[in-house]
């Protein structure tokens, strides 16, 4: 059986996020069975975690991971040195910044230590799998008597996100959304003074600076106004 | 919060030098691509110099005339500016980019994605 496999992910690029190829083989054998696919997410440019389903394995396997960077100065077969754990079998590897060249392609290949034609390679385009940390030090301020300006902080370099802001009301079933640009401010201009608003954020690797599809986590809400004291509508209230 | 504050900018007559700072908060510039655009009256924004992965890229027209620097322990960047003439004359902005981007990836830039520059005026 000679099989070779190149699949692209599909992750919203003209070229794809990774590829996979798993070397050929010449007989029906353990080393025929796929190799788990590698999931990358680089978090906040801080470090990167490449994990795999070890469960997929038909026998509990350690599984190895080397990578490096094709066509760069980087481009010597490293050796994972961190790896996670899942029910003490290896589950992933993690990566520190400076391991991290986000605008080189990373070529990541997994491999059984006891079948060593058992292996899969794949090529990510690190910048489209970048994930902020959640956005920070939200805050309200009345621009006029019905209109408020949400504010709030990123750990990253600002013109490298875009937001989304949602907002609802206590009366309201469903979110209201916003998409924001890397400006990071969104102003409401009509505001209920009965009523009492929570407000929300997120935040993305897109467009200036990669193009990646995942949201951070939802920021810690914050709330305005008073669902309570009927005699000032007014009367406002921070939340973190 | 991420913030670069320049500082350093003033007139000047042609000939003369200046020193632009910025002073970086929030991240380390030591990680980062960090280097200087500038915008001059009715001009698009224009790169004058970046640090990219090892390599430093300056624009044509300011070649062995302005040299960028960095002191990490400060997280401050500079930009020297000798021999500066009229056309130099622009709001200079400090700029940083995730690590690596302006060498291989880099595309154009706003000014406005940045801080609020500082200005640079050089009279005949």
């Known amino acids: 059986l000679n099989t070779t496999i190149l699949t692209p992910n599909g992750n919203e690029d003209t070229t794809a996020d990774f590829f996979l190829t798993t070397m050929p083989t010449d007989s029906l054998s353990v080393s025929t069975l796929p190799l788990p696919e590698v999931q990358c997410f680089v978090f906040n440019v801080e470090y990167m975690n490449c994990t795999w389903n070890s469960s997929s394995e038909p026998q509990p396997t350690n599984l190895t991971l080397h990578y490096w960077y094709k066509n760069s100065d980087n481009d010597k077969v490293q050796k994972c040195s961190h790896y996670l754990f899942s029910e003490e079998i290896t589950s992933g590897c993690q990566l520190q910044k400076k391991e991290i060249h986000l605008y080189q392609t990373f070529v990541v290949q997994l491999q059984d230590p006891r079948e060593p034609r058992r292996q899969a390679t794949q090529m990510l385009k690190l910048q489209n799998l970048v994930i902020p940390w959640a956005p920070e030090n939200l805050t309200l301020h009345k621009l006029s008597e019905s209109q408020l300006e949400l504010n709030w902080n990123n750990r990253f370099l600002n013109h490298c996100l875009e937001h989304l802001v949602q907002y609802r009301t206590d009366w309201d079933h469903s979110w209201t959304e916003q998409s924001v640009d890397y400006r990071h401010k969104f102003s409401l201009p009509s505001v209920d003074g009965q009523k009492r608003y929570t407000f929300r954020v997120r935040s993305r690797f897109n467009p200036l600076c990669g193009s990646a599809q995942h949201w951070s986590e939802w920021s810690h809400p914050i709330h305005w106004g008073s669902n309570t004291s009927k005699e000032n509508p007014f009367l406002f209230a921070l939340e973190a | 919060q991420v913030q670069l504050q320049e500082s350093g900018g003033g007139s000047v007559q042609a000939g003369g030098s200046l020193k632009l700072s910025c002073t970086v908060s929030g991240f380390t510039a030591d990680d980062s691509d960090m280097g200087w655009y500038r915008q001059g009256p009715g001009n698009e924004c224009e790169l004058v110099t970046i640090?990219?992965?090892?390599?430093?890229y300056y624009a044509d027209s300011v070649k062995g005339r302005f040299t960028i620097s960095q002191d990490n322990a400060k997280n401050t960047v500079y930009l020297q500016m000798n021999s500066l003439k009229p056309e130099d004359t622009a709001v200079y902005y400090c700029?940083?980019?995730?690590?690596?981007?302006?060498?291989?990836?880099?595309?154009?830039?706003?000014?406005?994605?940045w801080g609020q520059g500082t200005q640079v005026t050089v009279s005949s």
């Open positions: 700029a940083a980019e995730p690590r690596g981007y302006y060498s291989n990836y880099g595309g154009r830039r706003e000014c406005n994605y």
């Open positions: 640090s990219s992965d090892g390599s430093t």
